[in-house]
């Protein structure tokens, strides 16, 4: 055994990392809210829109207290991976009417990807179990019409907004347990 290769620099403490993850999640939440408002302005929603392939909302705010750190991070990562896949699909197959949401939709995708990497790094640093994401779901079928793409966009942005809102609350609560 030889000497260590010089004094290592301190990387962010997992608690500080959780802080920056919360900030990133909040920023993504604001982006999503803004993009959803932009979509509503251009294409008003006629009621609620659902998409069967989207994950169900992980948890009600009231039930957050019982959560454990690994469960929150694992579920959040799985749900955000699904939303990332849906945003990629929307950009690829959403049709010309949704091109008006660029470059904001591209920025949203990049930030979502960054948040996912941050969550995985946090789980690694804490040495929490990291179950693999669910096996890839079958490819999403292209929307049947331009209006189908718009309805899908309403559902995706609405669901992502709720998930990120839940994520911020969950992460802040977990910080108190670290």
């Amino acid at each position: 055994p030889g000497p260590p290769p010089g004094p290592p620099r301190v990387s962010p403490d997992p608690r500080a990392e959780l802080d920056s993850t919360v900030l990133l999640t909040r920023s993504l939440l604001a982006d999503t809210r803004q993009l959803a408002a932009q979509l509503r302005d251009k294409f008003p929603a006629d009621g609620d829109h659902n998409l069967d392939s989207l994950p169900t909302l992980a948890m009600s705010a009231g039930a957050l207290g019982a959560l454990q750190l690994p469960g929150v991070l694992t579920r959040l990562r799985a749900d955000l991976l699904s939303y990332l896949r849906h945003v990629q699909w929307l950009r690829r197959a959403g049709g010309s009417s949704l091109k008006t949401l660029e470059p904001e939709l591209g920025t949203l995708q990049a930030r979502l990807d960054r948040l996912l990497r941050r969550l995985q790094l946090l789980m690694s640093r804490l040495a929490l179990p990291q179950p693999p994401p669910d096996p890839p779901a079958p490819p999403l079928a292209p929307p049947s019409s331009a209006w189908g793409g718009i309805r899908a966009a309403h559902a995706i942005l609405g669901g992502l907004h709720l998930t990120l809102d839940w994520a911020v609350r969950g992460l802040l609560l977990l910080k108190t347990r670290l």
């Epitope: 290592p8 301190v10 990387s11 403490d13 997992p14 608690r15 690994p70 991976l81 990497r117 941050r118 995985q120 790094l121 690694s124 640093r125 804490l126 040495a127 929490l128 179990p129 990291q130 179950p131 693999p132 994401p133 670290l178």
Partner: antibody, heavy 114, light 111 residues
């Protein structure tokens, strides 16, 4: 400055036991998962065991399962590896590592030989 | 037999750019787990060089860069220097082990 100092290595006969310790300083030990990684002479790195930041999760490489036990004492900023039923193929430099791993100790040599 | 596959050796002349590859399986890189890279200079402990596929810890020169695409990852070293001569290891979380796995290591020689 981050420091991880391993101790407890040495020469032991096959079938014998050793307990390695790793004293941590310069970072919030209780917020990091900790690993033991080993390197046989002239060979590559092999992950041995990991323990979560709070000690609630412990996982082992198949090659040491049932023989080695990882533990930690957050009040003492110390990581341990209890090694039983040692074999010649366990001969290696054992590194204690924190996080990803982000930080590594200088290693302690364990030699299993009769 | 390492779970992640790396070429055993690589070489280049000073100033050149060298790339080291790392491929995995369905329980690690293919499952979307991030890849980390370590440098081990002769006679020393490993040092984290790249984390989360492409991030550099503070103090690591920007000559070192990482990338990941689908089933494999790579480490690129540009403007090669004699002090870069070392062993380089990739690592990723493996869901079947519930721990990290390492590549077999690549010995980089600066000619």
């Amino acid at each position: 400055e981050v420091q991880l100092l391993e101790s407890g290595g040495g020469l032991v006969q096959p079938g014998g036991s050793l307990r390695l310790s790793c004293a941590a300083s310069g970072f919030t030990f209780s917020s990091y998962g900790m690993h033991w990684v080993r390197q046989a002479p002239g060979k590559g790195l092999e992950w041995v065991a990991v323990i979560s930041y709070d000690g609630s999760y412990k996982y082992y490489a198949d090659s040491v399962k049932g023989r080695f036990t990882i533990s930690r004492d957050n009040s003492k900023n110390t990581l341990y590896l209890q090694m039983n039923s040692l074999r010649a193929e366990d001969t290696a430099v054992y590194y204690c590592a924190a996080g990803v791993p982000d930080y590594w100790g200088q290693g302690t040599l364990v030699t299993v030989s009769s | 037999q390492s779970v992640l596959t790396q070429p055993p050796s690589a070489s280049g002349t000073p100033g050149q750019r060298v790339t080291i590859s790392c491929s995995g399986s369905s329980s690690n890189i293919w499952s979307g787990y991030d890849v980390h890279w370590y440098q081990q200079l002769p006679g020393t402990a490993p040092k984290l060089l790249i984390y989360s596929n492409e991030e550099r810890p503070s103090g690591v020169p920007d000559r070192f860069s990482g990338s990941k695409s689908g089933t494999s990852a790579s480490l690129a070293i540009s403007g090669l220097r004699s002090e870069d001569e070392a062993d380089y290891y990739c690592a990723a979380w493996d869901s079947s082990l519930y721990g990290p796995v390492f590549g077999g290591g690549t010995k980089l020689t600066v000619l």
